[in-house]
């Protein structure tokens, strides 16, 4: 059963690795792939002392932990690299971190890349 | 510390019902979809079914479809699968596992025995 | 149907190196399959190896890795040990939610 599912077809696309990789610097990124399979928006990024650096955002193979996502949220607490992954046409123009903890009160921090 | 444990087995005559639950915590249950996956006595691994994070889409083995249904509770950190018209073939311990991105289990509970017997 | 194909056993020294494939039906196994490798011993619950190919679980040491080998994910033992002796399962995602187990390999290390 699949309710309310949005299709993506294309992601905006950033490479923080641009020159060593060969690839555009940003962009829109079409989304391939086998047409029984879903596809997704990613985004990975850092945070440096405060400042947001973004790693990559792009296109994400069909992964059922994306399933349902209409929006790009960082939910881990903590993490290393950020990572969110969502469903929907540039679903991950924006994309935020929200950690949720069993005890304490989350905080939420929205993110507008301007890479 | 991660920890899933699943309760609900127990011995059911064919064509009966049972609810299996797996109670969650140490990580954030609303934001990871959930699995469960089976092993008769002797034998391997199975998938059995799997939940998003919403619980809007849910997936099933063809063997079991239309006889399980998998939901989940965010609020209760809670996964349930409810198994109606049982057969003897689903005797079985049944896994509850969490689900992590690139679509692997990363962490497991120790399984409930279902027995189907008469 | 996908049917996953596992060797159903296999033996090695201790010490020595050995590698347990994992194929389908359907064609080749490729990264976007997300193959991820489980490790299990009687009675236990399943412990995960190895994810999305070839990146190691936290705390499993660097003896196991894995890759794709021609048209097959794989799974190496470098340096076996006597309590690697398990049962180990390949699950590959064939997408839309779909997790499909292969029938697993018994391992025994010899001696």
């Known amino acids: 059963a699949i309710l309310g599912r949005s299709e993506t077809q294309e992601c905006l696309f950033f490479n923080a690795n641009w020159e060593k990789d060969r690839t555009n610097q940003t962009g829109v990124e079409p989304c391939y792939g086998d047409k029984d399979k879903r596809r997704h928006c990613f985004a990975t990024w850092k945070n440096i002392s405060g400042s947001i650096e973004i790693v990559k955002q792009g296109c994400w193979l069909d992964d059922i932990n994306c399933y349902d996502r209409t929006d790009c949220v960082e939910k881990k607490d903590s993490p290393e690299v950020y990572f969110c992954c969502c469903e929907g046409n540039m679903c991950n123009e924006k994309f935020s971190y929200f950690p949720e903890m069993e005890v304490t009160q989350p905080t939420s921090n929205p993110v507008t890349p301007k890479p | 510390e991660v920890q899933l444990l699943e309760s609900g087995g127990g011995l059911v005559q064919p064509g009966g019902s049972l609810r299996l639950s797996c109670a969650a915590s140490g990580f954030t249950f609303r934001n990871s979809a959930m699995s469960w996956v089976r092993q008769a006595p002797g034998k391997g691994l199975e998938w059995v079914s799997s939940?998003?994070?919403?619980?809007?889409?849910?997936y099933y083995t063809d063997s079991v479809k239309g006889r399980f249904t998998v939901s989940r509770d965010n609020s209760r950190n809670t996964l349930y699968l409810q198994m109606n018209s049982l057969r003897a073939e689903d005797t079985a311990v049944y896994y509850c596992a969490k689900v992590y991105y690139y679509s692997f289990f990363d962490y497991w509970g120790q399984g409930t025995l279902v027995t189907v017997s008469s | 149907q996908t049917v996953v194909t596992q060797e159903p056993s296999f033996s090695v020294s201790p010490g020595g190196t050995v590698t347990l494939t994992c194929g389908f039906n359907?064609?080749?196994?490729?990264?976007?399959?997300?193959p991820s490798w489980y490790q299990q011993t009687p009675g236990q619950a399943p412990r995960t190896l190895i994810y999305n190919t070839n990146t190691r679980s936290s705390g499993v040491p660097d003896r196991f890795s894995g890759s794709i080998l021609g048209n097959k994910a794989a799974l190496t033992i470098t340096g076996a040990q006597a309590d690697d002796e398990s049962d180990y399962y390949c699950?590959?995602?064939?997408?839309?939610?779909?997790?499909?187990f292969g029938g697993g390999t018994k391992l025994t290390v010899l001696g």
């Open positions: 359907s064609g080749s196994v490729s990264t976007s399959y997300y």
């Open positions: 699950v590959l995602y064939m997408g839309s939610g779909i997790h499909v």
């Open positions: 939940i998003s994070v919403t619980g809007g889409s849910t």
